[in-house]
Interface confidence: low
């Protein structure tokens, strides 16, 4: 397993609709054709997988149908969007990148993006 550097922003604030976007950039040591991107959430020293996608270079990322993540790729950058976030989902979101094919296998893990989610205030009653 060879190490690879992965960069991601330190802090991101989710929108009022519970959507957070950030860029995950990796320093590819070779010409990978198949890349796997995994988003991990670390909270209270527990690491859980949020979503994952494999993509062929130049193609779209394909997350599972029920995934809360979407994304696009451009060269060695992946633009990730996580939806449906609530205040309880605030935490450190870590980008894990694996260069799957061709060998050798490379693995890189970012330092994480702290995503802050603030639940919107309920709207007051209105006659409109």
């Amino acid at each position: 397993c060879k190490a690879m550097h992965v960069a991601q922003p330190a802090v991101v604030l989710a929108s009022s609709r519970g959507i957070a976007s950030f860029v995950c950039e990796y320093a590819s040591p070779g010409k990978a054709t198949e890349v796997r991107v995994t988003v991990l959430r670390q909270a209270d020293s527990q690491v859980t997988e949020v979503c994952a996608a494999t993509y062929m270079m130049g193609n779209e990322l394909t997350f599972l149908d029920d995934s809360i993540c979407t994304g696009t790729s451009s060269g060695n950058q992946v633009n990730l969007t996580i939806q449906g976030l609530r205040a309880m989902d605030t935490g450190l979101y870590i980008c894990k990148v694996e260069l799957m094919y061709p060998p050798p296998y490379y693995l890189g893990i970012g330092n994480g993006t702290q995503i802050y989610v603030i639940d919107p205030e309920p709207c007051p009653d209105s006659d409109f």
Partner: antibody
Framework: EVQLVESGGGLVQPGGSLRLSCAAS????????MSWVRQAPGKGLEWVAT????????SYPDSVKGRFTISRDNSKNTLYLQMNSLRAEDTAVYYC???????????????WGQGTLVTVSA | DIQMTQSPSSLSASVGDRVTITCRAG??????LAWYQQKQGKSPKLLVY???TLAEGVPSRFSGSGSGTQFTLTISSLQPEDFATYYC?????????FGGGTKLEIK
């Protein structure tokens, strides 16, 4: 219920070949990365080979690289391990194992078969 | 390859005892560690993954902890069915390697 049943083990001479099979049931086989793990008599566990869901990616440790080939037939729900140029040190129980879920590649082995014994001896 | 070292290699304990098994990784593997139990003549069974998450159906007397390079598997109160060999395994990249095992025997 997840079931993995290995077959094809037996006695083979050094330099010989053997093909192991693993019949899978109780889950959607094509959705999961699969592996082979072996255990020499009285020894610990050693990962042997891994194949991705569609079969496009395979991985091996140096100890078997170039001699062993992992493959799968998703239409038959079957995993294979073709072992060539066998050596005495390949003697072991070979387990078929399923990764925990299909959405990641490098993970733990959540389900194991009962194993099949391969003995390499003159 | 990442070297995984387990200690002790064997351990004698009694029913009801609290037992701790240690696994050390040769480099930082974050929380990418799994524990397995193997009874004599049987295939291994997953106990813990991601260092501390119990696999489905595993009794709560088992617990995993640690991150980085130091990990532990604890059995809070040994039951007769817990006497077996325990293995750790990293799942931080390939090749995945196992510890040498810890054989837990009845005192």
């Amino acid at each position: 219920e997840v079931q993995l049943v290995e077959s094809g083990g037996g006695l083979v001479q050094p330099g010989g070949s053997l093909r192991l099979s693993c019949a899978a049931s109780g889950f959607t086989f094509s959705s999961y990365t699969m592996s082979w793990v072996r255990q020499a008599p009285g020894k610990g566990l050693e990962w042997v080979a891994t194949i991705s869901r569609g079969g496009g990616y395979t991985s091996y440790p140096d100890s078997v690289k170039g001699r062993f080939t992992i493959s799968r037939d998703n239409s038959k729900n079957t995993l294979y391990l073709q072992m060539n140029s066998l050596r005495a040190e390949d003697t072991a129980v070979y387990y078929c194992a399923r990764e925990d879920y299909g959405s990641s590649y490098v993970h733990w082995f959540a389900y194991w078969g009962q194993g099949t014994l391969v003995t390499v001896s003159a | 390859d990442i070297q995984m070292t387990q200690s002790p290699s064997s351990l004698s304990a009694s029913v009801g005892d609290r037992v701790t098994i240690t696994c050390r990784a040769g480099e930082n593997i974050y929380s990418y560690l799994a524990w397995y139990q193997q009874k004599q003549g049987k295939s291994p069974k997953l106990l813990v993954y991601n260092a501390r998450t119990l696999a489905e159906g595993v009794p709560s007397r088992f617990s995993g902890s640690g991150s980085g390079t130091q990990f532990t598997l604890t059995i809070s109160s040994l039951q007769p069915e817990d006497f077996a060999t325990y293995y750790c395994q990293h799942h931080y990249g390939s090749p995945r390697t196992f510890g040498g095992g810890t054989k837990l025997e009845i005192k």
